[in-house]
C-alpha cells in the first residue's frame, strides 16, 4: 500500500523539514526560515511559535520541530505546551484577582502556584497532630498510639496554635 501510494503521490517522499511544493512540480522544498514540518508528506510548513513577552524560548524552532516556550522568572506555565504564563506567588500565598494574598489560618500552600488548601485533618485517619501546620506547610500527622513501636518517635501533643506563617523551627 505504501509503495502504491508513493507511486501515486510524489509528496509522500518528502521528509520532515520539507514540504511538497505544488508551484515547483511537487518537488520537496526545504521549509522556509521560521517554519517547520514535523512529519513527512506535508504540503505546507507550519509557522514556528514565537516566545515573546512573558514567554521565553526553551527550545529553538528547527526545520523539523516547533519552538517550545516556558515563562520568564516570576511566572509559571499553565495549559498544554505552556499556552499561558501565570504569576508566581510566595510559598504561603495564593494568587487572587487582587494579586498574591497570604493563606488564611488553617490553610497552607507549599508551592509557588495553586491555591491555599486546608491543613490535613489527622483525626480522619485516627491519628494525632505530630507537627502543627503553618501557612507554608501542612500539619504532620503522627501514628496513632496503637501504632507506636520501639524506635518510633512518640507523638507530641499539639503545641498552642500559632499564627499562620510562623514556622516551627
Amino acid at each position: 500500500f505504501e509503495r502504491t501510494r508513493s507511486l501515486q503521490d510524489p509528496c509522500s517522499n518528502c521528509p520532515a523539514g520539507t514540504f511538497c511544493d505544488n508551484n515547483r512540480n511537487q518537488i520537496c522544498s526545504p521549509c522556509p526560515p521560521n517554519s517547520f514540518s514535523s512529519a513527512g508528506g506535508q504540503r505546507t510548513c507550519d509557522i514556528c511559535r514565537q516566545c515573546k513577552g512573558v514567554f521565553r524560548t526553551r527550545k529553538e524552532c528547527s526545520s523539523t520541530s516547533n519552538a517550545e516556550c516556558d515563562c520568564t522568572p516570576g511566572f509559571h506555565c499553565l495549559g498544554a505546551g505552556c499556552s499561558m504564563c501565570e504569576q508566581d506567588c510566595k510559598q504561603g500565598q495564593e494568587l487572587t484577582k487582587k494579586g498574591c494574598k497570604d493563606c488564611c489560618f488553617g490553610t497552607f500552600n507549599d508551592q509557588k502556584r495553586g491555591i491555599c488548601r486546608p491543613w490535613t485533618n489527622c483525626s480522619l485517619d485516627g491519628k494525632s497532630v505530630l507537627v502543627n501546620g503553618t501557612k507554608e506547610r501542612d500539619v504532620v500527622c503522627g501514628p496513632s498510639p496503637a501504632d507506636l513501636s520501639p524506635g518510633a518517635s512518640s507523638v507530641t501533643p499539639p503545641a498552642p496554635a500559632r499564627e499562620p506563617g510562623h514556622s516551627p523551627q
Epitope: 488548601r117 490535613t120 506547610r137 504532620v140
Partner: antibody
Framework: EVQLLESGGGLVQPGGSLRLSCAAS????????MSWVRQAPGKCLEWVSV????????YYADSVKGRFTISRDNSKNTLYLQMNSLRAEDAAVYYC????????????????????WGQGTLVTVSS | QSVLTQPPSASGTPGRRVTISCSGS????????VTWYQQLPGTAPKLLIY???HRPSGVPDRFSGSKSGTSASLAISGLRSEDEADYYC???????????FGCGTKLTVL
Amino acid sequence: EVQLLESGGGLVQPGGSLRLSCAASGFTFSGYDMSWVRQAPGKCLEWVSVIYPDDGNTYYADSVKGRFTISRDNSKNTLYLQMNSLRAEDAAVYYCAKHGGQKPTTKSSSAYGMDGWGQGTLVTVSS
Amino acid sequence: QSVLTQPPSASGTPGRRVTISCSGSSSNIGNNYVTWYQQLPGTAPKLLIYADSHRPSGVPDRFSGSKSGTSASLAISGLRSEDEADYYCATWDYSLSGYVFGCGTKLTVL
C-alpha cells in the same frame, strides 16, 4: 510489605529513548505520590520527577524538563518514566520511590519523605 | 552543585556521637520539612528521619534530626560499624517546584 520493582533500563545511544517501569505492590498505589530518583555511579542522589495521585500533577528537575515524562497507571499499580533525547549525563541507576502520607486525607506528602524504594535499574547512555 | 550543602565526609569511633549538617535557604529548608536518608554500600536509600526530627518505626533512637533556620542536622550517637554509609538530607524547594537532595556525607566508623 511495600515492594517496588523497576525495569526497562539498558544501553541506549545519545539522543535515544527508553521507558522505565516500576511495578508496585504491598500498598494502595493510587493513594501515594511517587517519584523517580537517580544516582550516577559514585555520585549523589538526584531527584528526577514526582507525580501526584489525586490531580495527576507532575513536577520535574530542570535537568530533565521537556525530555522526560512521568506517568502512572493506577489500575496496573505501575509508575513509568519515558526518557527521550537521552544524554551521557543521564546515565545512572534510576530508583522508583513511594512517598509517605496517604492521599486524599494527607494534603501534602513533603513532610513524610520517600519511605519505600526499589532496588533500581541501570541506564547506560553511550555510543 | 547541589542546592543543599553537606560535608563530603564525617568520621567517628564506635560508641561516640557524630553530627552531619545540611545547609540550605528559605525556599527549601527554611520553610519546608527536612528528611534524612541512609544509603548502605550497594543498596537503595532508606528513610531515616522525616518532618525534621521524627523517626519512622524501626529506626533506632540513636538517630535524631533537628532544624534551625535554614540548616538541619542529623546526629548519630553510640556509633556502630554498621552505621558506615552515605547520609543524604532532602526537602521540597518551592522556588524550583521540586525536591532537592544534598550531595551526601560519607560516614566512616574508625
